[in-house]
């Protein structure tokens, strides 16, 4: 899978709008690295 | 209102460094990447790098590894590109850019910084 | 590093014309692919994301399409503020790469 800043920002994106933005407050890009996919 | 304003205009010898500004405000810096972007007179655009503002991590462009430099201050919400060895071809328009989630999911950019490298 | 070639560089049309721009990758970038309009003087503007994408604001006559190493930006109708240059990009890869830009002139 696509490891970039960009891939992980956008699919990080799709994760919060599926879950309705119910997310830890530290899930943010910066903090999430690829494996977490 | 997320905004990414840029430091002015610069004009600089062959040789020397300049080092850009981009003040980010409206989200919370630390949690995006910061890309640079720049582009020469009626060239393409061409990526520089990036960095993780939160941990200081960057990826940078083999063609600028060891003349860009990317830094943060946190504590300014501001984000630095230095290029040194300046050449000629360095003249162009540079544009920090990050792609944000929240408050707003979009691709924000800089206005761009103008650098004109002259003897 | 990859390659993104645009075609066309530059093409004329008409308020109200269908407008296609392809871009190809020189290796697979999966969907990996946004589209940015530029005017002149001005910062690129972000159009589409993963490859068929709108960000929000972007009006609906702008579409994306494409998976692998051929991609499509698609305007349907084309309206006198989108006459500018527009850019393919990659980011599947580092370090990411732009394509070399289509203008969108008046016929």
């Known amino acids: 899978a696509c490891d970039t800043a960009t891939c992980v920002t956008h699919r990080l994106a799709g994760l919060l709008s599926r879950s309705g933005g119910v997310v830890k407050n530290n899930f943010v890009p910066t903090n999430v690295g690829s494996k977490a996919f | 209102e997320v905004q990414l304003v840029q430091s002015g205009a610069e004009v600089k010898k062959p040789g020397a460094s300049v080092k850009v500004s981009c003040k980010a405000s409206?989200?919370?810096?630390?949690?995006?990447?910061m890309n640079w972007v720049r582009q020469a007179p009626g060239q393409r655009l061409e990526w520089i790098g990036d960095?993780?503002?939160?941990?200081?991590?960057?990826n940078y462009n083999q063609k600028f590894k060891g003349r860009a430099t990317l830094t943060v201050d946190k504590s300014a919400s501001t984000a630095y590109m230095e290029l040194s060895s300046l050449r000629s071809e360095d003249t162009a328009v540079y544009y920090c850019?990050?792609?944000?989630?929240?408050?707003?999911?979009?691709?924000?950019w800089g206005q761009g910084t103008t650098v004109t490298v002259s003897s | 590093d990859i390659q993104m070639t645009q075609s066309p560089s530059s093409l004329s049309a008409s308020v109200g014309d269908r407008v296609t721009i392809t871009c190809k990758a020189s290796?697979?970038?999966?969907?990996?692919v946004a589209w940015f309009q530029q005017k002149p003087g001005k910062a690129p503007k972000s159009l589409i994301y993963?490859?068929?994408y709108r960000y929000s604001g972007v009006p609906s006559r702008f579409s994306g399409s494409g998976s692998g190493t051929d991609f499509t930006l698609t305007i349907s109708s084309l309206q006198p503020e989108d006459f500018a240059t527009y850019y393919c990009?990659?980011?599947?890869?580092?370090?990411?790469?732009f394509g070399g830009g289509t203008k969108v002139e008046i016929k």
């Open positions: 960095i993780n503002p939160n941990t200081g991590g960057t």
């Open positions: 850019a990050s792609i944000i989630i929240v408050p707003n999911y979009f691709d924000y």
């Open positions: 993963s490859a068929s």
């Open positions: 990009q990659q980011y599947n890869n580092y370090p990411y790469t």
């Open positions: 409206g989200y919370t810096f630390t949690d995006y990447y």
């Open positions: 290796q697979n970038v999966d969907t990996n």
